[in-house]
């Protein structure tokens, strides 16, 4: 069984989520990759994807999401800029490998976006918020639509574990087939 884990990011409106998803270089370098949100009780929804085949270090921008696939490093970089409270949720990277179902990359990202600057531990009350406007200069790629009724999977339950520290890791559940997920736009 595979241990499904997630890392929690607590950010403020206007900030940037900047994360990486590692993948096996030899196997997936040119495969199309996607960034998905998983809402409770729903299928994962693809928000952005790289081109097909995926181009090395070529930024793809969909709204406030920027994807960069570094083939030579075996990592997909995902940035969500100018975060909004509504961006809060559980996210994951997947690799498209038709005709097979998408392959999920670990770890998942639990994003919590809050308004303003509160006095929570590890943050600062008097910092000014950054609202950064990104120029729409990059490419938007079309994401494939996958349907696969036999892998309908509910999103994992929200963990009640204390995950306030950077090293926190939530062990959601032991799963076997959950790593293959269908994708809906």
């Amino acid at each position: 069984a595979t241990k499904l884990t997630e890392e929690k990011y607590e950010l403020k409106e206007g900030q940037t989520l900047d994360v990486k998803c590692d993948y096996t270089l030899e196997k997936f370098a040119s495969s199309q990759k996607a960034w998905q949100i998983i809402r409770d009780g729903e299928m994962p929804k693809t928000l952005a994807c790289t081109e097909r085949p995926s181009k090395n270090s070529h930024p793809v921008q969909v709204g406030r999401i920027i994807l960069e696939d570094y083939h030579d490093h075996g990592l997909l970089r995902v940035r969500m800029v100018n975060l909004q409270v509504e961006d809060s949720g559980l996210y994951q990277c997947v690799i498209y490998q038709p005709p097979k179902e998408p392959h999920m990359l670990f770890d998942r990202i639990r994003l919590v976006v809050t308004k303003g600057f509160s006095g929570t531990p590890g943050s600062n009350e008097n910092s000014t918020q950054n609202v950064y406007k990104i120029p729409p200069t990059t490419t938007k790629a079309l994401c494939p639509l996958y349907t696969s009724p036999r892998t309908v999977t509910q999103a994992p339950p929200k963990s009640t574990a204390d995950v306030s520290t950077p090293d926190s890791e939530i062990n959601l559940t032991n799963v076997t087939d959950i790593i293959r997920v269908p994708v809906f736009n």
Epitope: E7, L11, K12, Q15, T16, D18, V19, K20, C21, D22, T24, L25, S57, I66, Y70, H73, G74, L75, R79, V81, D107, I109, F117, S123, N124, S127, N130, Y132, I134, P166, D167, E169
Partner: antibody
Framework: QVQLVQSGAEVKKPGASVKVSCKAS????????IHWVRQAPGQGLEWMGW????????NYAQKFQGRVTMTRDTSISTAYMELSRLRSDDTAVYYC??????????????WGQGTLVTVSS | SYELTQPPSVSVSPGQTASITCSGD??????VGWYQQKPGQSPVLVIY???KRPSGIPERFSGSKSGNTATLTISGTQAMDEADYYC????????FGGGTKLTVL
Amino acid sequence: QVQLVQSGAEVKKPGASVKVSCKASGYTFNGYYIHWVRQAPGQGLEWMGWLNPNSGGANYAQKFQGRVTMTRDTSISTAYMELSRLRSDDTAVYYCARDQRKTTVTPFEYWGQGTLVTVSS
Amino acid sequence: SYELTQPPSVSVSPGQTASITCSGDKLGERNVGWYQQKPGQSPVLVIYQDNKRPSGIPERFSGSKSGNTATLTISGTQAMDEADYYCQAWDRNVVFGGGTKLTVL
């Protein structure tokens, strides 16, 4: 607790190679990138590259391409940085550092104590 | 190649506020970290994700960002804060600013 312990100081002649080790403890070695940063006397921090201990893959700063090799031995949770064709301006303290999280490349929350490498004829 | 620009030096009187800036292209899209380094010691992370403090870092250290400029602010500066400070960001590669020497007069 997380610890990165580096090998001792080295004195090398120009043209030689040096291999610095960084032994990790207190966490799952495969889960976090290890970076190498150097600092010449009186100078700032200079990033040399990162190592993905899980895959063994590395990413080197352009300046060091062709001269640096980063490897690891997962059985002993140790990362290595080898710099070849040493010159006098490679004299510096070399640090290994660990990512704060598994899903980010920066910042570096944990640092080794540093290894002084002196290149002198 | 990507560069982060810091002032070489900043001076402040004890108890006053010190501000160190770091600017770079598209820094608004990137998370900024700040490190403190005292002579003969390894760097210490004092701010990450623009404005968060790791545990153990005093509250007088704060970070902010406006557009493409990040700022490290030390309020009520103490003699022990005298050190070199470096900003850091991830472009295609990891980049450090040139460093700022903070002198507490």
